[in-house]
């Protein structure tokens, strides 16, 4: 039974280029050396994994090459950036943190960040 406290902002507005950034912060009960961070998207009763990364404390956060996420870590704080977002991707993005090693295993789920994405208006044709 190990539900850590995980904090994340309630609302974030993506940039016109479809990029959204937010901080996911967790209160570690122990001295974890290996941490796994997962971003989940919840729509109604469906939960899908957006991206995930495992990192060693003090090292950089590494997502897979084809991931839409990038991030950096500092202590018990992870700065997450999701790119390539479109209006249809507007929704609740949940930060899940797992302390993988050493035991004991701890898990925490944030309340979610509502990311709003507005597709940019197409540029009007120029008459030249």
């Amino acid at each position: 039974c190990k539900a850590m406290h995980v904090a994340q902002p309630a609302v974030v507005l993506a940039s016109s280029r479809g990029i959204a950034s937010f901080v996911c912060e967790y209160a570690s009960p122990g001295k974890a050396t290996e941490v796994r961070v997962t971003v989940l998207r919840q729509a109604d009763s469906q939960v899908t994994e957006v991206c995930a990364a495992t990192y060693m404390m003090g090292n950089e956060l590494t997502f897979l090459d084809d991931s839409i996420c990038t991030g950096t870590s500092s202590g018990n704080q992870v700065n997450l950036t999701i790119q390539g977002l479109r209006a249809m991707d507007t929704g609740l993005y949940i930060c899940k943190v797992e302390l993988m090693y050493p035991p004991p295993y701890y898990l925490g789920i944030g309340n979610g960040t509502q990311i709003y994405v507005i597709d940019p208006e197409p540029c009007p044709d120029s008459d030249f």
Epitope: C1, K2, A3, H5, A27, S28, P29, G30, K31, L40, Q42, S45, V47, I94, K96, E98, P103, P104, Y105, Y106, L107, I109
Partner: antibody, heavy 115, light 108 residues
Framework: EVKLDETGGGLVQPGRPLKLSCVAS????????MNWVRQSPEKGLEWVAQ??????????YYSDSVKGRFTISRDDSKSSVYLQMNNLRVEDMGIYYC??????WGQGTSVTVSS | DIQMTQSPASLSASVGETVTITCGAS??????LNWYQQKQGKSPQLLIY???NLADGMSSRFSGSGSGRQYSLKISSLHPDDAATYYC??????????FGGGTKLEIK
């Protein structure tokens, strides 16, 4: 080697108190949230109580069935966790396990409530 | 409170077979689920944590999967030693951290 040794179980009359103790070794006790879980043939495994550690201000949580009657406590200097059970009922009978996180389990101590 | 429904309550299978045990939560639990193995007369042992991660010292024939509200434990190439009762448990706050009712596995 990880060890959790529960003691204090036994036969007790309904309405009477009983205190269980658990001594841990082989892991960093202060990093663990400690729990008591009980098991009976009627109810299977049932989580009873949890006490978190210093970074979480030793917060305590209880199942509804024991709230107000049971108290969980810990002594990090002795790597020990306790369960004070008051006003025991017949339905509290079972094997009580002490767990470190949920990763480590003791061998259990049996509690029988009968007049 | 979130309820955990485990099925089947019991099953019997032969050595070498593959079996699957399922656990359903009454609400989304985001993979916050553990599986335990309890052999006759012994304490439960952590088998799978966080829905998919195999606990130290456990055979790789055990695997966990699932998301949202539905989770499963798969045991491949059954051994006689796998005879036990298996429990799932929700480890998501708030409490209680409820267990499923258990699945008793008998090896023929």
């Amino acid at each position: 080697e990880v060890k959790l040794d529960e003691t204090g179980g036994g036969l007790v009359q309904p309405g009477r108190p009983l205190k269980l103790s658990c001594v841990a070794s082989g892991f960093t006790f202060s990093d663990n949230w400690m729990n008591w879980v009980r098991q009976s043939p009627e109810k299977g495994l049932e989580w009873v109580a949890q006490i978190r550690n210093k970074p979480y201000n030793y917060e305590t949580y209880y199942s509804d069935s024991v709230k107000g009657r049971f108290t969980i406590s810990r002594d990090d200097s002795k790597s020990s966790v306790y369960l004070q059970m008051n006003n025991l009922r017949v339905e509290d009978m079972g094997i009580y396990y002490c767990t470190g996180g949920m990763d480590y389990w003791g061998q259990g101590t049996s509690v029988t409530v009968s007049s | 409170d979130i309820q955990m429904t485990q099925s089947p309550a019991s099953l019997s299978a032969s050595v070498g077979e593959t079996v699957t045990i399922t656990c359903g939560a009454s609400e989304i639990i985001y993979g916050a689920l553990n599986w335990y193995q309890q052999k006759q007369g012994k304490s439960p042992q952590l088998l799978i944590y966080g829905a998919t991660n195999l606990a130290d010292g456990m055979s790789s024939r055990f695997s966990g999967s699932g998301s949202g509200r539905q989770y499963s434990l798969k045991i491949s190439s059954l051994h006689p030693d796998d005879a036990a009762t298996y429990y799932c448990q929700k480890i998501l706050s708030p409490p209680p951290w409820t267990f499923g009712g258990g699945t008793k596995l008998e090896i023929k």
